[in-house]
């Protein structure tokens, strides 16, 4: 019984790990800006799942910087006072209020690029980020509900006769565990102080023609399947194989 997925149900595909830190962004290039200008302004808020330990770039509405008066990034993180990073074009000055996380910075000089970057995203970066652009034509907003994703560590083992245990440890949000074939299963969820969740599913198969069982773990960071051969010997421990 995994946690409900966010509304956009964005499934991040797993890929081969690069040595460089992966980076994600919802920013648009110049061509997209002109095509989607009005559409983006209407989409004020975006739910955005981001993998932990990657870099993230958050963008302001696609307004030409020459039309700008003030850019403000408002950052609301759990249990902290609201942090604001502001840039005033007329005086070319920046100001920060209640901002303590050094990993959250302007991408470059705000007079050249209004984007915000988070270097090495951590669980504590879960929160709401909003860019407010003040122009002669009015104020334009773009907000992000940033959901930090943590890939669970998946294990599968047999701990008793015809009983297997599949665990998705310390994931965020909670993973969902399913079995093929279905057995007599009990699932536990545990919530940890660092914001992660462990899901443990213990299943028993009474039917003796079931020799191999598969644990399928669904998670926003990607899915994983492990299978194991059920041993007849009580108490025998056997590790799983990855598909």
């Amino acid at each position: 019984e995994g946690a409900a997925q966010p509304n956009n149900s964005l499934m991040l595909q797993t890929s081969k790990e690069n040595h460089a830190l992966a980076s994600s962004s919802l920013c648009m290039d110049e061509k997209q800006i002109t095509q989607n200008y009005s559409k983006v302004l209407a989409e004020v808020n975006t739910s955005w799942p981001v993998k932990m330990a990657t870099n993230a770039v958050l963008c302001c509405p696609p307004i030409a910087l020459r039309n700008l008066i003030i850019i403000t990034w408002e950052i609301i993180l759990r249990g902290q006072p609201s942090c604001t990073k502001a840039y005033k074009k007329e005086t070319n000055e920046t100001k920060e209020t209640n901002c303590t996380d050094e990993r959250i910075t302007w991408v470059s000089r705000p007079d050249q690029n209004s984007d915000l970057q988070i270097r090495t995203v951590a669980i504590t970066h879960d929160g709401y980020y909003r860019c407010i652009m003040v122009t002669p034509d009015g104020n334009f907003h773009r907000g992000y509900h940033l959901q930090v994703l943590v890939t669970p560590e998946v294990t599968l083992f047999q701990n008793r006769n015809r009983t297997a245990v599949c665990k998705a440890v310390a994931g965020k949000p909670a993973a969902h565990i399913s079995w093929i074939p279905e057995g007599d299963c009990a699932t536990k969820q545990e919530y940890w102080s660092n914001g992660t969740v462990t899901v443990k599913s213990t299943c028993h198969w009474e039917v003796h023609n079931v020799s191999t069982v598969t644990c399928h773990v669904s998670h926003l960071t990607g899915n994983k399947s492990l299978y194991i051969e059920l041993l007849p010997v009580p108490g025998a421990k056997k590790s799983a194989k990855l598909y």
Partner: antibody, heavy 119, light 108 residues
Amino acid sequence: QVQLQQPGAELVKPGAPVKLSCKASGYTFTSYWMNWVKQRPGRGLEWIGRIDPSDSETHYNQKFKDKATLTVDKSSSTAYIQLSSLTSEDSAVYYCARSGGWLPGFAYWGQGTLVTVSA
Amino acid sequence: ENVLTQSPAIMSASPGEKVTMTCSASSSLSYMLWYQQKSSTSPKLWIYDTSKLASGVPGRFSGSGSGNSYSLTISSMEAEDVGTYYCFQGSGNPLMYTFGGGTKLEIK
């Protein structure tokens, strides 16, 4: 309502083992982990380890790995902790406490068993 | 292992006085729990999810904090608040539950 019942006290000779019990009632015993916590007189709380009654999976604080063994009896909804080769350092109150679910901690505690190691 | 350091170890307050105790974590957390323990009794869950009061806890108590730094505050000290308060976390792989060393609160 949830209850965790523990005997009040145990007097043990140095070098001997002791097995303490914690009888659970008011909930499905196999649905929650059972933890054990040690408190020496006038001192703080230390987590010893925990056991999943559904399949007897255990996690131990490394400090207590050679001292404590956790077991359960599902038929009587009782959790046990066996402490080996007792010394004066083991004189303490031992609490059982239920964890699991939405709370990353222990919502329910037993009254504790005072273990006194004395010749 | 995430080490929790509480300060002060012992404090005393007069009735009506505001009381604040802190808990520092060696690794960043999303949630902190607090327990209250009175002499010769089991600990009681007092605050969970950093700032939510457990059932039966008076409204003069509050919790706050984020990341590595958390605090428990009593807006107006009362005699029944005497006891030892422990911060608590559960996380890690392998799992480890840890308690802070405790803050003993006495009344003047």
